[in-house]
Every structure is written in structure tokens, then in C-alpha cells.
Interface confidence: low
């Protein structure tokens, strides 16, 4: 199609012939050349020759690894981006005659810039720090310090800070406090109870034993009324071994004031003041 000046449309060709004036602007998808408006080449094609009064703009498709992504008057197509594996890049989206190749980084790496010209390994978060945001193809790992109540004991590019174990929910007690790098250590509550309960039990048994020995002594007094003045014993001896200890120790019986007294071997024979009298 022959390209004519724009004034032909506006004022008619006759007027233009009398007062020729070059166009100052062209329509969309056109360009001005040699006082004429020529069609731009469509995306995926490059310019071979401009239009004339008698010929259309001549365009040619881009080659195998080339592209042009806009309406253009370029005489050369652009080369597709090369995703250099030596820079850690790989093809995310293959280029066409109208689009460039899109590169991305290999697994474990991210782009160093928006243009993704090279890659860098994802950073990991050290123990005491957790991952706030996992790295993407374009951004590095974002770490944050583990707050009180949380911990991280590994270097990782994925692990967040973990909450301390709740001993209470497991019916356990905290045996060792947690830190930002270590979890709390839980233990059975029995240990704590035992520390309190065992001495109490022993105390009770001890008191019962005292009472029993006292009652036994009182019960063993002669029933016939002896002409002894009534006196309380001044000393009471009870066995050193608590209940449950070895009771098979050899014993000997002696008579004190007509009352048999059982005496263990190896124990000092002591008689109450009342019995000696």
C-alpha cells in the first residue's frame, strides 16, 4: 500500500499538491521516515527495508535464538538471554521470537539482582536463629533471633524457631531450663514429689516407732503391785535400724528385774534408771 502524507486525509490531495507539508506525527504502530509514515514491524520480526510511496514496510521473522518483544523498526533481533549454568542459572521459561528467555537460579540458590544475571547460595540461620522468611529465587533467607520460649539448635535455611516443649501438658516438670539454642528438659514429677514425700513418710514412721516402743515398754511392766515408787523411765532405747532393715541379727535374752529384755548382739546393753534401781 502506497503511503501518502497525512494532510491528504485532512485537507485533500489537491491542497497538499499546492502547499506540500511533511507530516509531524504518525499513528500508533507507525513511524516517520522520509516525510512518510511507515508501519512498524510486529513483535517477533525485524525491519528489512522502510516503506516508500509505492512499497510497504518490509519485515522478516527473527532467527532461532532471537526475539523482539515490541512493535519496532529494529534492523537486528535481540539474542535470547543465556542462562549460564556456571553462574547457577537455568531456564525457567524458554524464549520465543516475541519473548526473551527467563532465567532462574538452581535449587538452593537465588538471584543476585532483579535481572537475575547470576546466583548466590541461600544463607542459613545459625543455632539460636530461625528462618523468618525462606529464600526464594530472588531473595535470600531472612533470619530472626529465637525469642524467649523458642529455640533452634541447627544451622538451616528452612527451620523456624521451635517452641520449647511444654512439660506441663505432658504431666512432667522442667528439670532444665531452655535457651535460644536448646529445648527445655522435662522430667517425671515423681522425683520432685519424692523429695518432699519420702522424708515425711520416714518422719511419720519414726514417730509411730517411738510410740510403739513406748507402749511396749509400758505394757511390759509387772501387773503385781510392786512396792516400787512409780517413776517414768528416764531413758528409752529404740532400735537404730528402721522398719524394713535386716531383723535377723542374733539376739540374746537377759533378765532384768524379772523382765526379759531382748538385746541384739553388738548393741550396748543399757538399762533404764528405773530398772537398775
Amino acid at each position: 500500500m502506497v503511503r501518502l502524507p497525512l494532510q491528504c486525509v485532512l485537507w485533500g490531495c489537491l491542497l497538499t499538491a499546492v502547499h506540500p507539508e511533511p507530516p509531524t506525527a504518525c499513528r500508533e504502530k507507525q513511524y516517520l521516515i522520509n516525510s512518510q509514515c511507515c508501519s512498524l514491524c510486529q513483535p517477533g520480526q525485524k525491519l528489512v527495508s522502510d516503506c516508500t510511496e509505492f512499497t510497504e514496510t518490509e519485515c522478516l521473522p527473527c532467527g532461532e535464538s532471537e526475539f523482539l518483544d515490541t512493535w519496532n523498526r529494529e534492523t537486528h533481533c535481540h539474542q535470547h538471554k543465556y542462562c549460564d549454568p556456571n553462574l547457577g542459572l537455568r531456564v525457567q521459561q524458554k524464549g520465543t521470537s516475541e519473548t526473551d528467555t527467563i532465567c532462574t537460579c538452581e535449587e538452593g540458590w537465588h538471584c543476585t539482582s532483579e535481572a537475575c544475571e547470576s546466583c548466590v547460595l541461600h544463607r542459613s540461620c545459625s543455632p539460636g536463629f530461625g528462618v523468618k522468611q525462606i529464600a526464594t529465587g530472588v531473595s535470600d533467607t531472612i533470619c530472626e533471633p529465637c525469642p524467649v520460649g523458642f529455640f533452634s539448635n541447627v544451622s538451616s535455611a528452612f527451620e523456624k524457631c521451635h517452641p520449647w516443649t511444654s512439660c506441663e501438658t505432658k504431666d512432667l516438670v522442667v528439670q532444665q531450663a531452655g535457651t535460644n539454642k536448646t529445648d527445655v528438659v522435662c522430667g517425671p514429677q515423681d522425683r520432685l514429689r519424692a523429695l518432699v514425700v519420702i522424708p515425711i513418710i520416714f518422719g511419720i514412721l519414726f514417730a509411730i516407732l517411738l510410740v510403739l516402743v513406748f507402749i511396749k515398754k509400758v505394757a511390759k511392766k509387772p501387773t503385781n503391785k510392786a512396792p516400787h515408787p512409780k517413776q517414768e523411765p528416764q531413758e528409752i532405747n529404740f532400735p537404730d535400724d528402721l522398719p524394713g532393715s535386716n531383723t535377723a541379727a542374733p539376739v540374746q535374752e537377759t533378765l532384768h528385774g524379772c523382765q526379759p529384755v531382748t538385746q541384739e548382739d553388738g548393741k550396748e546393753s543399757r538399762i533404764s534408771v528405773q530398772e537398775r534401781q
Epitope: 549454568p85 535449587e107 543476585t112 547470576s118 546466583c119 548466590v120 547460595l121
Partner: antibody
């Protein structure tokens, strides 16, 4: 204690080929990087190549090493380095090394090295 | 490839002195830098990672600083045991682990 050990170092003639092997003890290569570094007698350290032992299995070379040297993982505990077209300039102690994610990929594990001598 | 340039190539200081080693990256590597100590016949030992974080068991006399392209390792109160070669390394930035040329530290 985790360790790395290189083997395969030898005295060879120029133009010969050689395969070096790095064997891990008490750990396996699971989604980690394994590298080879060399050091010519009385010279500095020179990075050769690294391989990623994860699913993507990428390999990365110093520009001077591309084409002549090939790094590959041969099992869960071994990585090899194939050397071809050897010249006297390749005479060096070859170290197997493991960069660590916890150290921003600095190398915290090294083997003792294996000596490759290229001489006619 | 990223190129790491380390200066000086050697440094000599008396016991109790201070040594400063510089490392420059050919492009910004953020804080992806490690420092190693190597003694003859041994593999390198990690001293500092993430430009300034001390590896476990490393003396606080070792101090790393910097980010982007300029990094520094400072060793204060030098001891005889600090005599070694020190290397900087870019760690996993743009899939590259290049080392600096190394600095030999002599303690007088």
C-alpha cells in the same frame, strides 16, 4: 568423628588421565556440596570444582578447569575427579573439601590430600 | 570468574605485634568471604566465615571485617603459633569458590 580421604594420586606421564576418589567416613553426601581444591608445591590454593549431591546434581567448575576436569558423585559416600590431558603444571596435592551451609559455604571439612605428579 | 586479590604476599612481625591482610574481590560478593590458616603439610583450617564470624575454637585475636569487594583479616598479639600462610576465599557466590593468592606470615 567425620572425615574425608582422597585416593588415586600417582606419578603419571604428560597427556595421561587419572581419576581421584574422595571417600567420606561416618557421614554421607546428602544434599550437600563436595569440592576439589589443589595446591601446587610451594604455591597457593586453587579451587577446581564443586558438585551438589542433592536432586538437581549441579556441577560447577573454575573456568580454567572446564573441559579437562570432571567432578561426579559415584555413591552416597564417594565423589570423583577425572583429570585428562595432564601436564606438569597439574602437579599438585589435590584436596577433597566440603563447604558447609552453616558456615555460609566456607569449607570446614578437608581431606589430608593426595599427590599427583606429572613428569616425563 | 570472580578473582580474589590478596595483599601483601608476605608479612613479618614480632611476637605481640599485629598483622593486617587485605583481600579484594573483582566484584561485590556481599559478605560471602572466608579466611583460612594453613601450615606446611596440613590442609587449611577455617578461621572466619561470613566475613567476620569466628569459627568455633578460633582465638578472638583473629578479626575479620569488610563487605562487598574489600575485606581485611587482622591478627593481634601475634604468637609463634600464628606463623602460617593465610588465604581468603569467596564462598559460594555466583557458584564460585576462588581463593586469594595467600599471605605468608612470619613471626619474629
Amino acid at each position: 568423628c567425620q572425615s574425608l580421604e582422597e585416593s588415586g594420586g600417582d606419578l603419571v606421564k604428560p597427556g595421561a588421565s587419572l581419576t581421584l576418589t574422595c571417600t567420606a567416613s561416618r557421614f554421607s553426601f546428602s544434599s550437600t556440596y563436595m569440592c576439589w581444591v589443589r595446591q601446587a608445591p610451594g604455591k597457593g590454593l586453587e579451587w577446581i570444582a564443586c558438585t551438589y549431591t542433592g536432586s538437581s546434581g549441579g556441577t560447577y567448575y573454575a573456568s580454567w578447569a572446564k573441559g579437562r576436569f570432571t567432578i561426579s558423585q559415584t555413591s552416597s559416600t564417594t565423589v570423583t575427579l577425572q583429570l585428562t590431558g595432564l601436564t606438569p603444571a597439574d602437579t599438585a596435592t589435590y584436596f577433597c573439601a566440603r563447604p558447609d551451609v552453616g558456615f555460609d559455604f566456607a569449607i570446614n571439612f578437608w581431606g589430608p590430600g593426595t599427590l599427583v605428579t606429572v613428569s616425563s | 570468574d570472580i578473582v580474589m586479590t590478596q595483599t601483601p604476599s608476605s608479612a613479618s612481625e614480632p611476637v605481640g605485634g599485629t598483622v593486617t591482610i587485605k583481600c579484594q574481590a573483582s566484584q561485590s560478593i556481599s559478605s560471602r568471604l572466608a579466611w583460612y590458616q594453613q601450615k606446611p603439610g596440613q590442609p587449611p583450617k577455617l578461621l572466619i566465615y561470613r566475613a567476620s564470624t569466628l569459627a568455633s575454637g578460633v582465638s578472638s585475636r583473629f578479626k575479620g571485617s569488610g563487605s562487598g569487594t574489600q575485606f581485611t583479616l587482622t591478627i593481634s598479639d601475634l604468637e609463634c603459633a600464628d606463623a602460617a600462610t593465610y588465604y581468603c576465599q569467596c564462598t559460594g557466590y555466583t557458584i564460585s569458590w576462588p581463593f586469594g593468592g595467600g599471605t605468608e606470615v612470619v613471626v619474629k
